[in-house]
């Protein structure tokens, strides 16, 4: 099994590892499937691409019957199988079978924290946000290891790219020192940013 690892939105080339001459195409059926679902077929020269791969998949017949998937999505991750059937003695027989495992990475960048003063009060508001990752993120605010209550946390998903964005607000009393951590967990991964507030200088120091 061949393993291919790519970043989301990149291009992945999955090779069948087999060549068929133009002359042989009329007597050949090629099936690319992903986890038992069809991606692409070429039957005696007629090509058909399944709806979820249309307009973003190229079949490269000259390059080992490869499929090229453009603008990778997280849901493209999985095991692909290429089957080549050749016509011989009144039937199509399996001439070649190959498996390619595709991993699609979609890491959230380190979140950014911006702060705003709320006029005529001792309350200051900070906003933590990041976008462009997968799977669905879970954001929490921590201070001294204890979880805090955010004002509101919003998680949205782009229906086309399948990537998530997350944003959360936290209000705090600016008359005391604080060190807040914005922690985002997604799948088995995590990313965080720390915001420090120092009352003596009335300034903050985000960790980089």
């Amino acid at each position: 099994v061949i393993h291919v690892t790519k970043e989301v939105k990149e291009v992945a080339t999955l090779s069948c590892g087999h060549n068929v001459s133009v002359e042989e195409l009329a007597q050949t059926r090629i099936y690319w499937q992903k986890e038992k679902k069809m991606v692409l077929t070429m039957m005696s020269g007629d090509m058909n691409i399944w709806p979820e791969y249309k307009n973003r998949t190229i079949f490269d017949i000259t390059n080992n019957l490869s499929i090229v998937i453009l603008a990778l999505r997280p849901s493209d991750e999985g095991t692909y199988e290429c089957v080549v059937l050749k016509y011989e003695k009144d039937a199509f027989k399996r001439e070649h079978l190959a498996e390619v495992t595709l991993s699609v990475k979609a890491d959230f960048p380190t979140p950014s924290i911006s702060d705003f003063e709320i006029p005529t009060s001792n309350i200051r508001r900070i906003i933590c946000s990041t976008s462009g990752g997968f799977p669905e993120p879970h954001l929490s605010w921590l201070e001294n290891g204890e979880e805090l209550n955010a004002i509101n946390t919003t998680v949205s998903q782009d229906p086309e790219t399948e990537l998530y964005a997350v944003s959360s607000k936290l209000d705090f009393n600016m008359t005391t020192n604080h060190s807040f951590m914005c922690l985002i967990k997604y799948g088995h991964l995590r990313v965080n940013q720390t915001f420090n507030w120092n009352t003596t200088k009335q300034e903050h120091f985000p960790d980089n």
Epitope: S44, G45, V83, K93
Partner: antibody, heavy 114, light 108 residues
């Protein structure tokens, strides 16, 4: 060349499993297809199975209704129909993959009646 | 899905007549992927012509096929009593595989 199981009469809501056993070849080496024909109607392709690895492909119209399986140890292909309704009354044929369907089973009549 | 439209849906002709059945395909396909079958009542379909114009094994030479792209034709040059049957075209260009609705041929 392809011998199918006998006619079945089933009640609505029941399931039925039709078998197809080739003589002279092993199904492991060929994709096996199923086609149906309702009384007085035309031919409708249901789907295929690659018996070697169990991969299947269905016409979306039959997804959830038909389940195609194969047992390579007995060289037999099966098609199970679930939640039967009167509209499922038809002759069901198995056929072997080729440039075209050169080999067909004799057909199995499935009658759904209360 | 590729739609297959046959015409006529039925016809009646005399023994010795030339009979033509047409099959219109909703999108262009390779001629290698167009096939014709003959089905007699109570029997499984039998291959007649494959790849537009090739006679299947044991098929009499009075049967012929032609066409390309989206338009295909099955011709019986001299209709015989044993040709009474329903004829179907079928595409193997893309899934799901589809058949025409059938043309019933009878003797006058």
């Amino acid at each position: 060349q392809l011998v199918q199981s006998g006619a079945e009469v089933k009640k609505p809501g029941a399931s039925v499993k039709v078998s197809c056993k080739p003589s002279g070849f092993n199904i492991k080496d060929y994709y096996m297809h199923w086609v149906r024909q309702a009384p007085g109607q035309g031919l409708e392709w249901i789907g295929w199975i690659d018996p070697e690895n169990g991969n299947t492909l269905y016409d979306p119209k039959f997804q959830g209704k038909a389940t195609i399986t194969a047992d390579t140890s007995t060289s037999t292909a099966y098609m199970e129909l679930s939640s039967l309704r009167s509209e499922d009354t038809a002759v069901y044929y198995c056929a072997r993959e080729g440039l075209f369907f050169a080999y067909w089973g004799q057909g199995t009549l499935v009658t759904v009646s209360s | 899905d590729i739609q297959m439209t046959q015409s006529p849906s039925s016809l009646s002709a005399s023994v010795g007549d030339r009979v033509t059945i047409t099959c219109s395909v909703s999108s262009s396909i390779s001629s290698s992927n167009l096939h014709w079958y003959q089905q007699k009542p109570g029997k499984a379909p039998k291959p007649l012509i494959y790849g537009t114009s090739n006679l299947a094994s044991g098929v009499p030479s009075r049967f012929s096929g032609s066409g390309s792209g989206t338009d295909y034709t099955l011709t019986i040059s001299s209709l015989q009593p044993e040709d009474v049957a329903t004829y179907y075209c079928q595409q193997w260009s893309s899934y799901p595989l589809t058949f025409g609705q059938g043309t019933k041929v009878e003797i006058k």
